[in-house]
């Protein structure tokens, strides 16, 4: 807390301007009117205040708005946003995308902070869902944003918002997240033709079930190995050698380099060796000829 001291004669601030950088902390506290500060917040960011001086200005706003700042003030916080705590931000009601953009701009290049996470959470909850414009904005500032959400939070993403998602936005998503996003993407892109559809759906395929992969194998898509390696192991295992060959097209040769890694390793173990030999890649580890394969999962289902 800054002590209450009288403002020295002639130092009362008539407006928020650069002369205030020469004020000591106690002078700022005594000589700057909180209401004046609130109406001239847009000027603060142009003035090279120190963090200590910003603390004083924040204290004045906190006293003026104990229940939380109005959006007119929030939009112009600038660097003062860096002094806010998540507790402060929880009191806000941010509804304008322009306000969100202004605050994210201040944090541009920064790691995702608890303050920003709280701000985004408040904004999205206020909107009720993660609409396309919001998602566009958030992924522009934080490409990993989507993958920072829980599967439960992702379930509120409408399929229409999926159009805003870029491949790099999904780089850090785990299978549980892709399981939620894939059906939405499938729905969003359903009216596209084969090759265009594959280009759009490719980044989401880590959540695709076996039947969708089988369907893709009939469409000459030429999936690259990087995409194949991100597929769910349980979705890849039931695919036949012929289906994988069709799915990968000319990229099938890349299986050799990945034969010790999942899901390729596990898939090889499930294939007949003579089927693998038809690929001519020297893949080893398949089921030897003459062996009977029992599908235990099918047996369990029947019993």
């Amino acid at each position: 807390e800054v002590e209450k001291t009288a403002c020295p004669s002639g130092k009362k601030a008539r407006e928020i301007d650069e002369s205030l950088i020469f004020y000591k902390k106690w002078e700022l506290e005594a000589c700057v009117d909180a209401a004046l500060l609130a109406t001239q917040m847009d000027r603060v960011n142009a003035i090279p205040f120190t963090y200590e001086q910003l603390d004083v200005l924040k204290h004045k706003l906190d006293e003026l708005y104990p229940q939380g700042y109005p959006e007119s003030v929030i939009q112009h916080l600038g660097y003062l946003f860096l002094k806010m705590s998540p507790e402060d931000i929880r009191k806000w009601n941010v509804t304008s995308l322009e306000t969100l953009k202004a605050l994210l701009e201040v944090n541009k290049g920064h790691e995702m902070s608890p303050q920003v996470a709280t701000l985004i959470d408040r904004f999205v909850k206020g909107r009720g869902q993660l609409d396309k414009d919001t998602l566009d904005t958030l992924t522009a500032f934080y490409p990993g944003y989507l993958c920072s959400l829980s599967p439960e939070e992702l379930s509120s993403v409408p399929p229409s918002s999926i159009w805003a998602v870029r491949p790099q936005d999904l780089d850090t998503c785990d299978p549980r997240q892709l399981d939620v996003l894939y059906p939405k993407a499938r729905l969003a892109f359903q009216n596209m033709n084969g090759s265009e559809y594959f280009v759009k759906i490719q980044s989401f395929l880590g959540g695709a079930p076996t039947e969708d992969l089988k369907a893709l194998s009939q469409q000459n898509v030429s999936m690259d190995l990087a995409t194949f390696m991100k597929l769910r192991t349980d979705a890849v295992l039931p695919l036949t050698v012929a289906e994988v060959q069709k799915l990968l097209g000319p990229h099938v040769e890349g299986l050799k380099a990945e034969e010790r890694h999942r899901p390729v390793r596990d898939w090889i173990l499930r294939q007949r060796q003579d089927d693998l030999d038809t690929l001519g890649l020297g893949l080893q580890g398949g089921i030897p000829n003459g062996y009977l394969v029992l599908d235990l999962s099918m047996q369990e289902a029947l019993s």
């Epitope: 090279p48 120190t50 001086q53 910003l54 860096l82 290049g109 920064h110 902070s113 303050q115």
Partner: antibody, heavy 117, light 107 residues
Framework: QVQLVESGGGLVKPGGSLRLSCAAS????????MSWIRQAPGKGLEWFSY????????YYADSVKGRFTISRDNAKNSLYLQMNSLRAEDTAVYYC??????????WGQGTLVTVSS | DIQMTQSPSSVSASVGDRVTITCRAS??????LAWYQQKPGKAPKLLIS???RLQSGVPSRFSGSGSGTDFTLTISSLQPEDFAIYYC?????????FGQGTKVEIK
């Protein structure tokens, strides 16, 4: 009086790791943002990371993003820099500085990091 | 990123001379500018903040001016201890960036 003392520099091979420390005294460390700035031999100054007083707000310049990690322990009045995947171009004197927002008002004496095979 | 360009890159002067160093920002930085002095083998020392605010303990022969994109550091009467490298630095946006430095040498 305000004092910042860096330590942990030395010779490391490309791809190696190093952890720098900065011991602060003479001021309330937990009230201040802190920055790391480096200077390659015979070159200018490059600011590349800062951390807020609580540690919640962090920034990395593109030149170090994904390789360096800034952290602090307010109970120990210490600032840290974990440097991984070091490259020859990371060779420099590394300074910690007290960051007051509009400028850096106090600097440590620096610690030399040499990345060479 | 905001580029900071200092000129000249070096200046030869004598004790008692008036020395002026300029710093230009690639975009408007208002008064978010600081000046530092660095001597060989030493850490930089803050001279001026907010374009013109002299740090306590810094001799009054040092002064700063400017706003927007053009800034000046002036040493009104050069002293023997002033021979050093001087850097400007902007804090308007991230990443903070420094000028390349101006070396003040003995003529």
């Amino acid at each position: 009086q305000v004092q910042l003392v860096e330590s942990g520099g030395g010779l490391v091979k490309p791809g190696g790791s190093l952890r720098l420390s900065c011991a602060a005294s003479g001021f309330t460390f937990s009230d201040h943002y802190m920055s790391w700035i480096r200077q390659a031999p015979g070159k200018g100054l490059e600011w590349f990371s800062y951390i807020s007083s609580s540690g919640g707000i962090i920034y990395y310049a593109d030149s170090v993003k994904g390789r360096f990690t800034i952290s602090r322990d307010n109970a120990k009045n210490s600032l840290y820099l974990q440097m991984n995947s070091l490259r020859a171009e990371d060779t420099a004197v590394y300074y910690c500085a007290r960051d007051v927002g509009s400028h850096f008002d106090y600097w440590g004496q620096g610690t030399l990091v040499t990345v060479s095979s | 990123d905001i580029q900071m360009t200092q000129s000249p890159s070096s200046v030869s002067a004598s004790v008692g001379d008036r020395v002026t160093i300029t710093c230009r920002a690639s975009q408007d930085i208002s008064r978010w500018l600081a000046w530092y002095q660095q001597k060989p083998g030493k850490a930089p020392k803050l001279l001026i903040s907010a374009a013109s605010r002299l740090q306590s303990g810094v001799p009054s022969r040092f002064s700063g001016s400017g706003s927007g994109t053009d800034f000046t550091l002036t040493i009104s009467s050069l002293q023997p201890e002033d021979f050093a490298i001087y850097y400007c630095q902007q804090a308007k946006s991230f990443p903070r960036t420094f000028g390349q430095g101006t070396k003040v040498e003995i003529k």
